[in-house]
């Protein structure tokens, strides 16, 4: 019989593959039907009978055309720092992704195995590189003329306001305070006008090293606890 009208199971011509959605069974030496996604092979084919497929049980799945004897188990329920972005069905595994404010520190084929909170840059430091689904925030010291007075995983260093007359000079963690009520350049919305204690650390005269981009969760590392990277806070 020509290949396209042969019914499974059939012996392929020498040098020919099986057709669409078929597999070659080494034992039967025949081309046999695969099972569709959501099913598995309950009974393998023989020379005279085709594969018998059955639906996957609850909490198990097959995503591909297959001839596996058992469906795969869906992954465990998502943890509290994750959201379920794809439910476990007969055709797909559960997918857990990190909730907002967290990033994936240890990914798996689909979704995330381990989430970690995004690093927060402390006052005097701003976000150099924002966090993504799979990477932590990178903090950098605020350059001369800029400041950040927040502990945040999103705030960048903002320019000091420019005063006609300076009451308190700005530093890396505090905006300049003007004596005049009308600075020449208004600051960014939401900026704090109240004077804050000036840091004793020499913010601008000494270059501060770029903080480590290591995850803020020390439990990921095969070593004892270590202090958080400079410019970041663990909470």
């Amino acid at each position: 019989l020509p290949a396209q009208v042969a019914f499974t199971p059939y012996a392929p011509e020498p040098g020919s593959t099986c057709r669409l959605r078929e597999y070659y069974d080494q034992t039967a030496q025949m081309c046999c039907s695969k099972c569709s996604p959501g099913q598995h092979a309950k009974v393998f084919c023989t020379k005279t009978s085709d594969t018998v497929c059955d639906s996957c049980e609850d909490s198990t799945y097959t995503q591909l055309w297959n001839w596996v004897p058992e469906c795969l188990s869906c992954g465990s329920r998502c943890s509290s720092d994750q959201v379920e972005t794809q439910a476990c069905t007969r055709e797909q595994n559960r997918i857990c992704t990190c909730r907002p404010g967290w990033y994936c520190a240890l990914s798996k084929q689909e979704g995330c195995r381990l989430c970690a909170p995004l690093r927060k840059c402390r006052p005097g430091f701003g976000v150099a590189r924002p966090g993504t689904e799979t990477s932590d925030v990178v903090c950098k010291p605020c350059a001369p003329g800029t400041f950040s007075n927040t502990t945040s995983s999103t705030d960048i260093c903002r320019p000091h306001q420019i005063c006609n007359v300076v009451a308190i000079p700005g530093n890396a963690s505090m905006d300049a305070v003007c004596t005049s009520t009308s600075p020449t350049r208004s600051m960014a919305p939401g900026a704090v006008h109240l004077p804050q204690p000036v840091s004793t650390r020499s913010q601008h005269t000494q270059p501060t090293p770029e903080p480590s981009t290591a995850p803020s969760t020390s439990f990921l590392l095969p070593m004892g606890p270590s202090p958080p990277a400079e410019g970041s806070t663990g909470d």
Epitope: S16, T17, L20, R21, K34, L64, W65
Partner: antibody
Framework: QVQLVQSGAEVKKPGASVKLSCKAS????????INWVRQAPGQGLEWIGW????????QFNENFKGKATMTVDESTSTAYMEVRSLRSDDTAVYYC????????????WGQGTTVTVSS | DIQMTPSTSSLSASVGDRVTITCRAS??????LNWYQQKPGKAVKLLIY???KLHSGVPSRFSGSGSGTDFTLTISSLQPEDFATYYC?????????FGGGTKLELK
């Protein structure tokens, strides 16, 4: 990234043969079928067949049995197709494409090789 | 062999338009319908497989629908880079066959 790079254009006389190549990179060559598809000038696409690189077994469109031969060189991740007894109506762009045998689609295509058959 | 026939060989549209391209199979092909985009001098690109599954990296403005014998490719808001020729292809039975193609042109 996953890509298929095909050999350059060919001009052949009627009755001659031509051997086209398709070099794969960016994935495990032996785990996907390589299909060949042709497109005559101003025409649609026509599937010629596929080869499974793991064992070299093939599946042909009946219209091309005896006309085309597909082979692979696993060591260089290259697929070849030889077309024999060329006629003017074999003038076409020949594409190689990576295929999925469950859904019958072609997810990665080569840039195509133009074969001109002219006396 | 299964014949695949596009409803039209060419179609004119403007940027921002919602465009539908249809394709009919000569017999039932279940959901085994794939769509491709071809631009001159460029490699052919898979857009949609198994009637409605979006291939990785394809913009979400492309979608597919239909079943049995009648299928539709929809572009929700046409972009300048979408002017090309579109092919349907059945993956139900061998030999695999393509439709004649629909050329999408600027109005």
């Amino acid at each position: 990234q996953v890509q298929l790079v095909q050999s350059g254009a060919e001009v052949k006389k009627p009755g001659a043969s031509v051997k086209l190549s398709c070099k794969a990179s960016g994935y495990t060559f032996i785990t996907y079928d390589i299909n060949w598809v042709r497109q005559a000038p101003g025409q649609g696409l026509e599937w010629i067949g596929w080869i499974y690189p793991r064992d070299g077994n093939t599946q042909f469109n009946e219209n091309f049995k005896g006309k085309a031969t597909m082979t692979v060189d696993e060591s260089t991740s290259t697929a070849y197709m030889e077309v024999r007894s060329l006629r003017s109506d074999d003038t076409a762009v020949y594409y190689c494409a990576r295929g999925d045998r469950d859904y019958g689609y072609f997810d990665v295509w080569g840039q195509g090789t133009t074969v001109t058959v002219s006396s | 062999d299964i014949q695949m026939t596009p409803s039209t060989s060419s179609l004119s549209a403007s940027v921002g338009d919602r465009v539908t391209i249809t394709c009919r199979a000569s017999q039932d092909i279940s959901n085994y319908l794939n769509w491709y985009q071809q631009k001159p001098g460029k490699a052919v690109k898979l857009l949609i497989y198994f009637k409605s599954k979006l291939h990785s990296g394809v913009p979400s403005r492309f979608s597919g629908s239909g079943s049995g014998t009648d299928f539709t490719l929809t572009i929700s808001s046409l972009q300048p880079e979408d002017f090309a020729t579109y092919y349907c292809q059945q993956g139900n039975t061998l030999p695999l066959t393509f439709g004649g193609g629909t050329k999408l042109e600027l109005k």
